[in-house]
């Protein structure tokens, strides 16, 4: 059974992930972002189901494309280089979902824009955090 300390650690990691995703979303939605139109043409794949930490596998598989989209944005929109930002997110996602569990992600039929994609995973983080508190 998860201990209170492991639950707290999970909560902190989710909060960190949530902040990173919100920061990316804010940077993309910046009214001075000249690449927004092109960024919105990138297709992102959404999970059919995202209710447990293991479902973060679906997020992990989209982090490569997410890095490429962030490479289009002006670096001043973000505190870190896209490579470093995604690297940080990968570490958090890996710790949350575990590296040993090989969960096969199932994707929804409809693709999403980067904004819809980020909002979906922000909602996921908020939902899991609320169950832990």
């Amino acid at each position: 059974a998860p201990t209170s300390s492991s639950t707290k650690k999970t909560q902190l990691q989710l909060e960190h992930l949530l902040l990173d995703l919100q920061m990316i979303l804010n940077g993309i939605n910046n009214y001075k972002n000249p690449k927004l139109t092109r960024m919105l043409t990138f297709k992102f794949y959404m999970p059919k189901k995202a209710t447990e930490l293991k479902h973060l596998q679906c997020l992990e598989e989209e982090l490569g494309p997410l890095e490429e989209v962030l490479n289009l944005a002006q670096s001043k929109n973000f505190h870190l280089r896209p490579r470093d930002l995604i690297s940080n997110i990968r570490v958090i996602v890996l710790e949350l979902k575990g590296s040993e569990t090989t969960f096969m992600c199932e994707y929804a039929d409809e693709t999403a824009t980067i904004v819809e994609f980020l909002n979906r995973w922000i909602t996921f983080c908020q939902s899991i955090i609320s169950t832990l508190t």
Epitope: K43, G64, P65, N71
Partner: antibody
Framework: QVQLVQSGAEVKKPGATVKISCKVS????????MHWVRQAPGQGLEWIGR????????KYAENFKGRVTITADTSTDTAYMELSSLRSEDTAVYYC????????????????WGQGTLVTVSS | DIVLTQSPATLSLSPGERATLSCQAS??????LSWYQQKPGQAPRLLIY???SLASGIPARFSGSRSGTDFTLTISSLEPEDFAVYYC?????????FGQGTKLEIK
């Protein structure tokens, strides 16, 4: 169906420069990140680098930096790979290949390939 | 750089047999791995992407699996046209790297 057609074989002297082309047909080049991969005779595959033709941003493998230049001409839907200071170890078949984030998940991988261009470096 | 180690270097089997090719990553790469088939004088052809997904037009006898940093390409029943060289490739981070290849030859 997307097709990549590369320029013909080249024979170069050591120290020279070679420029290979890769023409995209069936779609616009700006929908793809154009990558270059090489294969020395009887050897494995080695990633050289890539260009985003939409904004000309490039990424190169460390061991090619300073010698390789990847460019793209969106008016002709053609990508180019230029390698300078050629040496005998650069003798290889050079391939262009694509990645895109605009279509299916499968096309995020090296799904389309050119036929290859043999570059021979010999004195 | 991420190193991919393929084994065996050469695999000698007969048509109808099952082939199991291995690719081990030097670090965690998630599912960012694909498999390619290459025949002499031809460009590589995408077989499997995202570790387990079958590329379009590829026969169902090809399949991919993953356990941690170990990846496997399985050909359930070899056809004569399957004898070729197979490469794995990681897309987790640049520089993208390939395994050194496994040559599948007729016994």
């Amino acid at each position: 169906q997307v097709q990549l057609v590369q320029s013909g074989a080249e024979v170069k002297k050591p120290g020279a420069t070679v420029k290979i082309s890769c023409k995209v047909s069936g779609d616009t080049i700006t929908a793809y990140y154009m990558h270059w991969v090489r294969q020395a005779p009887g050897q494995g595959l080695e990633w050289i680098g890539r260009i985003d033709p939409d904004d000309d941003s490039t990424k190169y493998a460390e061991n090619f930096k300073g010698r390789v230049t990847i460019t793209a001409d969106t008016s002709t839907d053609t990508a180019y790979m230029e390698l300078s200071s050629l040496r005998s170890e650069d003798t290889a078949v050079y391939y262009c290949t694509t990645i895109t984030f605009y279509y299916s998940r499968e096309l995020r991988w090296f799904a389309y390939w050119g036929q290859g261009t043999l570059v021979t470096v010999s004195s | 750089d991420i190193v991919l180690t393929q084994s065996p270097a050469t695999l000698s089997l007969s048509p109808g047999e099952r082939a199991t090719l291995s690719c081990q990553a030097s670090q965690y790469i998630g599912n960012y791995l694909s498999w390619y088939q290459q025949k002499p004088g031809q460009a590589p052809r995408l077989l499997i992407y995202s570790a387990t997904s079958l590329a379009s037009g590829i026969p169902a006898r090809f399949s991919g699996s993953r356990s941690g940093t170990d990846f496997t390409l399985t050909i359930s029943s070899l056809e004569p046209e399957d004898f070729a060289v197979y490469y794995c490739l990681q897309h987790y981070s640049t520089p993208y790297t390939f395994g050194q290849g496994t040559k599948l030859e007729i016994k």
